[in-house]
């Protein structure tokens, strides 16, 4: 497997306490947002998930910086890639979504980052 | 000052029903997720169930999935979970607890005793 | 259902320091386990410690930090006083539920 380690801000929320409560609903459907953004991204072949999904408050705290990691079969895709196919898809983000997605930053994970199972 | 008063505990059967209660006080309850964890007697600390702010999302241990349910009313900052099915091994002091931060504030538990 | 491990007992020192661990079954311990501790004392209602790694709860002493610590989460306490001597839990989030530890039983020698 590869791995990919993603980062990126959306603009147009507001980060709160609620987001560093995995229990709660802001967390449970931002998390559900993104998940199936990523699988629309990505549906093409050799995506296998994403994991260790974590939130934080943007500049200012007043965006929400997202950090994960994306798992995809080995040798299907590279960085460039990843982030190519990401940034392409920040219009439909928007539109689908309601995200505003800025700064996105994709960098390789080096085998194995942990053993913690792909969600 | 934070309050979390639980109720309803006592000596049921196997395969009996309670239900416990959670009163908050202190706080603004409608904006913490909520939980309840347990204690056996002489035990660590087990989990048991947790529920949103608003009770859209509900989660359960796999030891208490399909007999437990986490309710919540707002209205009333009240928290409850209703046991169903009940065995033995749920024998403990039951807590609520809010979340955040560590679980930070807890009740002074309600025991909960199945033997026939 | 993942298991979550900690020390049983540990000793420390008034003064001293000590670092308390939890692991995870499923691997390493990361930020999106929202590592939590909570402290236990006779006599005394549960106290939340630590929440989402490392956020002190409020009134929490400046003595108690949560980090992560060669693949686990950690509760290191300096400045050991005799009123820390305490049982201490550590609980893990995945995915959809939290998981408790055993707990560790922490001895400050008198």
């Known amino acids: 497997m590869s791995f990919f380690f993603l980062s990126f801000h959306i603009s147009n929320l507001q980060f709160n306490s609620s987001l560093e409560d995995p229990s709660t609903d802001y967390y449970q459907e931002l998390q559900r947002d993104i998940s199936e953004m990523f699988l629309q991204i990505y549906k093409q072949g050799g995506f296998l998930g994403l994991s260790n999904i974590k939130f934080r408050p943007g500049g200012g705290g007043g965006s929400v910086v997202v950090q994960l990691t994306l798992a995809f079969r080995e040798g299907t895709i590279n960085v460039h890639d990843v982030e190519t196919q990401f940034n392409q898809y920040k219009t439909e983000a928007a539109s689908r979504y309601n995200l505003t997605i800025s700064d996105v930053s994709v960098s390789d994970v080096p085998f194995p980052f942990s053993a913690q199972s792909v969600d | 000052e934070v309050q979390l008063l639980e109720s309803g505990g006592g000596l049921v059967q196997p395969g009996g029903s309670l239900r416990l209660s959670c009163a908050a006080s202190g706080f603004t309850f409608r904006v913490y997720a909520m939980s309840w964890v347990r204690q056996a007697p002489g035990k660590g600390l087990e989990w048991v169930s947790g529920?949103?702010?608003?009770?859209?999302?509900?989660y359960y241990a796999d030891s208490v999935k399909g007999r437990f349910t986490i309710s919540r009313d707002n209205s009333k900052n009240t928290l409850y979970l209703q046991m169903n099915s009940l065995r033995a091994e749920d024998t403990a002091v039951y807590y609520c607890a809010r979340y955040p931060y560590g679980f930070d504030y807890w009740g002074q538990g309600t025991l909960v005793t199945v033997s026939s | 259902q993942a298991v979550v491990t900690q020390e049983p007992s540990l000793t420390v020192s008034p003064g001293g320091t000590v670092t308390l661990t939890c692991g995870s079954s499923?691997?390493?311990?990361?930020?999106?386990?929202?590592a939590n501790w909570v402290q236990e004392k006779p006599g005394q209602a549960f106290r939340g410690l630590i929440g989402g790694t490392n956020k002190r709860a409020p009134g929490t002493p400046a003595r108690f930090s949560g980090s992560l610590l060669g693949g686990k989460a950690a509760l290191t306490l300096s400045g050991a006083q005799p009123e820390d001597e305490a049982e201490y839990y550590c609980?893990?989030?995945?995915?959809?539920?939290?998981?408790f530890g055993g707990g560790t039983k922490l001895t400050v020698l008198r």
């Open positions: 499923t691997g390493a311990v990361t930020t999106s386990n929202y």
């Open positions: 609980a893990l989030w995945y995915s959809n539920l939290w998981v």
């Open positions: 529920i949103s702010e608003t009770g859209s999302y509900t």
